[in-house]
Interface confidence: medium
């Protein structure tokens, strides 16, 4: 095997097709993204087509939290998710394929762990198997990026800003500006998951507004100018 | 970016071997299952092969088993098909895509193979 | 081993609604994905597990599966939609399998 000791193999019982698992050691990503965490799995139940369940686990084998469960019908090939936690685990594998690959959307610092597939045959071949070594999967943390900075209308015939960044840690923002002082303080908004929003609620002056976001990994600054047309003396 | 880039494509005559490569980038290859695919001239989409992460499982289409062997290279982020005793109606683009469960989402920009006397 | 059957061509006016469909046994049982090749350049799909998009091909691309025939639909199909679409699943005998294709013709 080509990925040599990044991989471990689980196996018991005779030769020819046997049980094994096939999992990485470990899959990094940064916080924010997406990772995948591999399984490929062999079995003695030669054209087995009855029905299955697809489990993933975190923390321990056996007993650790369930994150993802799917199961297929007799003859199916969907495998039809019963059990995703928060909505951020699918199958990226074709388990009549003997691919148990699970993708995670949306990865935070607290996902990092260790994550253990598990197969279960629950027709006439009434048979399972899990990975007992897992793949640990390492979150690393995200410096600030700002994905959006806009000036919209406000009430009134005013204006406001919206300055939205991601980053793990979640970043903290700041607006300065043209306004005396120098620095208007931001209406913190709502924060999704890593992504985090301040709001400028009244640009009083024209000039350049500046977004600052700022975690323990770095900063990111991003700027909107604001002119309005004056009409003539 | 994510990128596949097929090479080794070229006229061969009947019963003759050829070796296409894929090179990967952009991406974890050793996450991904990979497939071989290919499209003769005029013609619609053949699924020709299928990889998996760790190379634990392979498959093939019926009309290439015996004589096509598909590999992979993960510390050289490269795929591998190996074409043995090859026929006029091998003739084809062969595209590299990456993929399992959630359909082939890469795709490579192809190598043409021709076989012929 | 299963086949999908598609129509070899389908036309459609511009700012209209094209349906291809893809038939093959026990279709409903299986996911469906959606290729669209355009030509001398590689595919791209369009649809995967049947009626999800992946990011960046524009909401007019939808896929539904009822009985045993699987449909992409394209609304509002615009000139740059022509193209050769292609339906694709696995068999259970771990093959993967393509529709013989569509020809998306764009009138006007």
């Known amino acids: 095997d080509a990925s040599g000791d990044l991989l471990n193999t689980e196996a018991h019982s005779a030769p020819a097709q046997r049980w094994s698992m096939q999992v990485p050691a470990e899959v990094n990503a940064e916080a924010g993204d997406a990772a995948v965490l591999p399984c490929t799995f062999t079995h003695p139940h030669r054209h087995y087509d009855g029905p299955l369940t697809a489990i993933w686990r975190s923390g321990e084998p056996y007993a650790g939290p369930q994150v993802f469960r799917c199961t297929a019908a007799p003859g199916s090939e969907l495998c039809q998710t019963a059990l995703s936690l928060h909505g951020r685990f699918r199958l990226l594998g074709n388990p009549r394929r003997n691919d148990l690959s699970l993708r995670v959307e949306r990865l935070a610092l607290a996902d990092s762990g260790r994550y253990f597939c598990r197969v279960e045959f629950t027709g006439d071949a009434h048979d399972r198997y899990e990975s007992r070594h897992g793949v640990r999967l390492r979150v690393t943390a995200a410096a600030p990026r700002i994905v959006n900075i806009s000036v919209l209308p406000g009430p009134a015939h005013a204006f406001r800003a919206l300055c939205t960044a991601e980053g793990e840690p979640p970043p903290a923002l700041a607006w300065s500006g043209p306004a005396p002082g120098n620095s208007s303080a931001a209406l913190q908004g709502q924060g999704h998951g890593y992504q985090v929003t301040a709001e400028l609620p009244a640009l009083t002056r024209d000039g350049r507004y500046t977004c600052t976001a700022a975690n323990s990994l770095g900063r990111a600054e991003a700027s909107v100018y604001l002119f309005r047309f004056h009409g003539a003396p | 970016q994510v990128q596949l880039v097929e090479s080794g494509g070229g006229l061969v005559q009947p019963g003759g071997s050829l070796r296409l490569s894929c090179a990967a980038s952009?991406?974890?290859?050793?996450?991904?299952?990979m497939n071989w695919v290919r499209q003769a001239p005029g013609k619609g989409l053949e699924w020709v092969s299928y990889?998996?992460?760790?190379?634990?499982?392979?498959y093939y289409a019926d009309s290439v088993k015996g004589r096509f062997t598909i590999s992979r290279d993960n510390s050289k982020n490269t795929l591998y098909l190996q074409m043995n005793s090859l026929r006029a109606e091998d003739t084809a683009v062969y595209y590299c895509?990456?993929?399992?469960?959630?359909?082939?989402?890469?795709w490579g920009q192809g190598t043409l193979v021709t076989v012929s006397s | 081993d299963i086949e999908l059957t598609q129509p070899p061509s389908v036309s459609v006016a511009p700012g209209q609604t094209a349906r291809i469909s893809c038939s093959g046994d026990?279709?409903?049982?299986?996911?469906v994905y959606w290729y669209q090749q355009k030509p001398g350049q590689a595919p791209v799909l369009v649809i995967y597990?049947?009626?999800d998009r992946p990011s960046g091909i524009p909401e007019r691309f939808s896929g539904s599966n009822s009985g045993n025939t699987a449909t992409l639909t394209i609304s509002g199909t615009q000139a740059e939609d022509e193209a050769d679409y292609y339906c694709?699943?696995?068999?259970?005998?771990?093959?993967?399998?393509f529709g013989g294709g569509t020809k998306l013709t764009v009138l006007g």
């Open positions: 694709q699943t696995y068999d259970m005998t771990s093959q993967d399998v």
């Open positions: 895509a990456r993929g399992a469960g959630l359909g082939y989402d890469v």
């Open positions: 952009g991406f974890t290859f050793t996450n991904y299952a």
């Open positions: 990889i998996s992460y760790s190379s634990s499982n392979t």
């Open positions: 026990n279709l409903r049982s299986k996911y």
């Open positions: 597990d049947t009626n």
